[in-house]
């Protein structure tokens, strides 16, 4: 019997793009690839696997805004940026099954227009394969 | 014989917390979880596996300090911050079996009080499973 | 039949060093280890596996320069730094088979001397083992 070296099961990861954010709401996220191993639902990224995640957030905004990235009600944000016109940040956070990663945005202008985003990208990459997952 | 897709052995990773640092010494680190795949010994994180590590360091300090994170005697620090009251940094470093990750702290006040830390967190995540490990 | 836990195949990763950059060209990169799972060819790091990569870039330069890190003709840079004397950045990017990671450098001095680099280091670590690779 020939031994075949084991292949890695696919790592949970996703890249979503966003070109528009709504004031006092969030950013409209879309996943450009059908091959992602994580899913978007109701404008949130669904976490199925417990563990550390590498998180990358980038974007240039059409006007100054305050932006937070949340993962669980009643918990502090993963990222929080106050009165910025761009973001290029990397972080590590422990997320768990049932968490949902979503944006909250507020602009400081009197107009309630949507905010346009150039190069808006959010990447999540699971760092602990082998841990608990629920699908 | 039914083929079961291989599971990942657990990745070497750890999150330690610290709420207190001693002037001209280090920070008192504790691991809040019993499930960590890496261990703390003599206030240092023990490295068993060779490879790149993703390192995240966060904290707010009760007074201005200079803080370094070391891994091996006679080598430069993984992080070095001078005269700060907070840290929120991410880095990548190559560590090897027998390395120990530990803090060194100096305050610039004349008093020799302990420094209290809020939200003090150090995360290490091994990036090269499959490489050499010694337990 | 005794079950042996599967070993991880080695992760695609590399650390290259650079001590010299040529104006209007790139930086001369060398891989200090023979055990790297990725290769350097024509001053570029060759990408064999599709997926996200964690990228760390560090260095102190002998004079002010503008530096970009590219991966594909006609695409924007992975990093772009204007008029800096040092870099210490981390990023995440999606790279694919046939991509090549290389530097472009411009100095703003009238002299066309090489730029000396202290602590010049570029690390790439594949984040999606189990995905497509071509060797």
């Amino acid at each position: 019997l020939q031994q075949v070296p084991p292949q890695y099961p696919p790592i949970q990861s996703i890249r979503v793009q966003f070109t528009r954010c709504e004031n006092e709401k969030g950013c409209i996220i879309t996943s450009p690839s059908k091959d992602e191993t994580m899913k978007v639902q109701d404008n949130s990224i669904i976490i199925n696997c417990d563990g550390f995640y590498l998180i990358s957030l980038k974007g240039y905004f059409s006007e100054e805004l305050s932006l937070s990235l949340y993962y669980r009600k009643g918990r502090g944000p993963l990222f929080s940026l106050s009165k910025v016109t761009s973001v290029d940040s990397i972080g590590v956070a422990y997320l768990a099954f049932k968490d949902k990663v979503y944006f909250n945005v507020t602009t400081h202008s009197t107009s309630y227009k949507d905010i346009q985003v150039n190069g808006g990208e959010l990447i999540l990459i699971h760092q602990n394969p082998g841990g608990f997952c629920a699908y | 014989l039914q083929q079961v897709p291989p599971q990942y052995p657990p990745i070497q990773s750890i999150r330690v917390q610290f709420t207190r640092c001693e002037n001209e010494k280090g920070c008192i680190i504790t691991s809040p979880s019993k499930d960590e795949t890496m261990k703390v010994q003599d206030n240092s994180i023990i490295i068993n596996c060779d490879g790149f590590y993703l390192i995240s360091l966060k904290g707010y300090f009760s007074e201005e300090l200079s803080l370094s994170l070391y891994y091996r005697k006679g080598r430069g620090p993984l992080f070095s911050l001078s005269k700060v009251t907070s840290v929120d940094s991410i880095g990548v470093a190559y560590l090897a079996f027998k390395d120990k990750v530990y803090f060194n702290v100096t305050t610039h006040s004349t008093s020799y009080k302990d420094i209290q830390v809020n939200g003090g967190e150090l995360i290490l995540i091994h990036q090269n499973p499959g490489g050499f490990c010694a337990y | 039949l005794q079950q042996v836990p599967p070993q991880y195949p080695p992760i695609q990763s590399i650390r290259v060093q650079f001590t010299r950059c040529e104006n209007e060209k790139g930086c001369i990169i060398t891989s200090p280890s023979k055990d790297e799972t990725m290769k350097v060819q024509d001053n570029s790091i060759i990408i064999n596996c599709d997926g996200f990569y964690l990228i760390s870039l560090k260095g102190y330069f002998s004079e002010e320069l503008s530096l970009s890190l590219y991966y594909r003709k006609g695409r924007g840079p992975l990093f772009s730094l204007s008029k800096v004397t040092s870099v210490d950045s981390i990023g995440v990017a999606y790279l694919a088979f046939k991509d090549k990671v290389y530097f472009n450098v411009t100095t703003h001095s009238t002299s066309y001397k090489d730029i000396q680099v202290n602590g010049g280091e570029l690390i790439l670590i594949h984040q999606n083992p189990g995905g497509f690779c071509a060797y």
Partner: antibody
């Protein structure tokens, strides 16, 4: 000029709930650690809860743990205190306080009065 | 938990020196903060980390701490200094502890 303005204080029955708000202006809200401190009538100051600038660390006084929740909305420059299962001994003026270094309270609001009585 | 003890009241003659103490087990090993609260007003930070004055606080206010006692000294007390004074530390669980407060009367 730095201003912290609390609101939401009211008369409430024992066992009831209230949510206090504190709107910050004149500071970079995301750089400041925020606390609630209360003062019962004729009594001294009593710290209630802290949330650090990044939101990564929250601590509560033992007497309110499990009943009160501190949170912050960076977009709205607002600190909150959700108070559930209120008791007569929670009657106090509630101050919002901020610190650039988390150990001291640089700025204070003028307070909002909470009365718990049947 | 850490307990801070203050005298309920202290009196001082106008332009004389007032000393307000704050007792606690090895308080000298902790950073001590002092707040002034005038009648009907919010507290104000007057001393941080034992002996440092924030911008705008008059030089007559000073602080010291060692052993089991921290002391706030007002050199040349003025009528406007009549107020309640609170000491504060953080315990090892990052919880803020206030003393019971001392009312300073300026005669």
């Amino acid at each position: 000029e730095v201003q912290l303005v609390e609101s939401g204080g009211d008369l409430v029955r024992p066992g009831g709930s209230l949510r206090l708000s504190c709107v910050a202006s004149g500071i970079t809200f995301s750089s400041y650690h925020m606390s609630w401190v209360r003062q019962a009538p004729g009594k001294g100051l009593q710290w209630v809860a802290l949330i650090n600038s990044g939101g990564s660390s929250i601590t509560y006084a033992d007497v309110v743990r499990g009943r009160f929740t501190i949170s912050r909305d960076y977009a709205k420059n607002t600190l909150y205190l959700q108070m559930n299962s209120l008791r007569a001994e929670d009657t106090a003026v509630y101050y919002c306080a901020s610190g650039s270094i988390w150990t001291h309270f640089d700025y204070w609001g003028q307070g909002t009065r909470v009365t718990v009585s049947s | 938990s850490f307990v801070l003890t203050q005298l309920p009241s202290v009196s001082v003659t106008l332009r004389q020196t007032a000393r307000i103490t704050c007792g606690g087990d090895i308080i000298g090993s902790k950073n001590v903060y002092w707040y002034q609260q005038r009648l009907g007003q919010a507290p104000v930070l007057i001393i941080y980390r034992d002996s440092n004055r924030p911008t705008g606080i008059p030089e007559r206010f000073s602080g010291a701490s060692s052993g089991n006692t921290a002391t706030l000294t007002i050199s040349g007390a003025l009528a406007e200094d009549e107020a309640d004074y609170y000491c504060q530390v953080w315990d090892n669980s990052n919880k803020a502890m206030f003393g019971g407060g001392t009312h300073l009367t300026v005669l």
